[in-house]
Interface confidence: low
Amino acid sequence: GELETSDVVTVVLGQDAKLPCFYRGDSGEQVGQVAWARVDAGEGAQELALLHSKYGLHVSPAYEGRVEQPPPPRNPLDGSVLLRNAVQADEGEYECRVSTFPAGSFQARLRLRVLVPPLPSLNPGPALEEGQGLTLAASCTAEGSPAPSVTWDTEVKGTTSSRSFKHSRSAAVTSEFHLVPSRSMNGQPLTCVVSHPGLLQDQRITHILHVSFLAEASVRGLEDQNLWHIGREGAMLKCLSEGQPPPSYNWTRLDGPLPSGVRVDGDTLGFPPLTTEHSGIYVCHVSNEFSSRDSQVTVDVLDPQEDSGKQVDLVSAS
């Protein structure tokens, strides 16, 4: 006869491990007892359990409550046992020794491998601002046994770098994703993908990118110079910019206070019916926590009674 077992048994941390040991004998042969022991190299054998054909299962004190026979129906030639709730410390070599009648004793070894699935964590990097060079966007760390694979899934262009630290029974892998921040990255997902043989499917953690920026400011409303004449109603200047965080707007007049009747409504400066008093230099100041921008325009209100042409200057400053 001969023993049938597995070279390697693989389980996930916390699962039950079936340690197989089946005697395939000739007709009429019987199994008297099966002894299970842990036999790691350099250490003496540590008894797990003894399975006796007449007296049943005896579990050694060190494994009390953790070693059981598989559920019925049971074959009298099957010496397999269940090791409940496998932990990392259970990883190692195991031996079953089978005493048969009349053929004598047989033994076989197997290796128990305990997979420790990772619990990944994603840490965003420092605040991203347009104009920075290559900057850490996020780092993702996963520790397990064996070492997990950590990759990134994103449409954003960037570079990755990985490092790993080996511990006594596991390995920690950290991957960093670096990028050159630009406003087009705002709202884009950056997903850390962790693969491991102990996971049924990849684990994914997503971070949404936020990039601070402030666009140049410009003023609209003076495109048609001839519309800015005495008596015109509904004249307005609009300040154009965009940013993240969304910017706030402030209007001032460079050559004095804003004329009475002029309404400030966020990015828009609304004028009452125009008079020559509305001529002047107007400044739009745009700011957010990241930066500030200015744009100034010169308004000349035309008097239709005069032949002199209206002058308009547009100046942008940052």
Epitope: L122, P189, T191, Q201, T206, H207, I208, H210
Partner: antibody
């Protein structure tokens, strides 16, 4: 335009398997994930699971053992199965679209599934 | 799982009112938060994603703010069509939704 059309029985017996289909148009299943969310009558929303654009799946851990999500890209269909249902599984079931992350920009019309004998 | 605590569970308001709904996560969700509006018998509609970004076609009276564990949805001037139930949802790992806030007519 983007649409998600749900189909499936409105009544399922206890201990049986609930099966729903989400047929999509206006986008490709190889570019977007399809999620399943449910809402018991008068209650809040609960995320159930997703099949990603690459075909991999993620499930709510509390329901993982009972859920199977699969797809047929040639038919633009996503299939949702929940086994061993009980009265507590009575809810409106929605499919919803997402990119590579977990918020949902387009939703199906919802299917009220009642679990009763 | 990360728990989302939404408050208030209901509120009464009038057209033109400023309405604020808050959502608190049991741990840092790094702005991975969405807000939805749901009307009776209808599917939810995405309003805000990534805490502050307005979804396509959503009126500018809606805005989202917050970071870390605390987030807010604000309706600057309530309109008749805004009476509905609002949900927050995090997408930092396994998604979970807040319990909802029903906005009713005063």
């Amino acid at each position: 335009q983007v649409q998600l059309q749900q189909s499936g029985p409105g009544l399922v017996k206890p201990s049986e398997t609930l099966s729903l289909t989400c047929t999509v148009s206006g986008f490709s299943l190889t570019n977007y994930g399809v999620h399943w969310v449910r809402q018991p009558p008068g209650k809040g929303l609960e995320w159930l699971g997703v099949i990603w654009s690459g075909g991999s799946t993620d499930y709510n851990p509390s329901l993982k053992s009972r859920l199977t999500i699969s797809r047929d890209t040639s038919k633009n269909q996503v299939s949702f199965k929940m086994s061993s249902v009980t009265a507590a599984d009575t809810a409106v079931y929605y499919c919803a679209r997402s990119g590579k992350w977990y918020y949902f920009d387009y939703w199906g019309q919802g299917t009220l599934v009642t679990v009763s004998s | 799982d990360i728990q989302m605590t939404q408050s208030p569970s209901s509120l009464s308001a009038s057209v033109g009112d400023r309405v604020t709904i808050t959502c608190r996560a049991s741990e840092n969700i790094y702005s991975n938060l969405a807000w939805y509006q749901q009307k009776p018998g209808k599917a939810p509609k995405l309003l805000v994603y990534a805490a502050t970004n307005l979804a396509d076609g959503v009126p500018s009276r809606f805005s989202g703010s917050g970071s870390g564990t605390d987030y807010t949805l604000t309706i600057s001037s309530l309109q008749p069509e805004d009476f509905a139930t609002y949900y927050c949802q995090h997408f930092w790992g396994t998604p979970t939704f807040g319990g909802g806030t029903k906005v009713e007519i005063k």
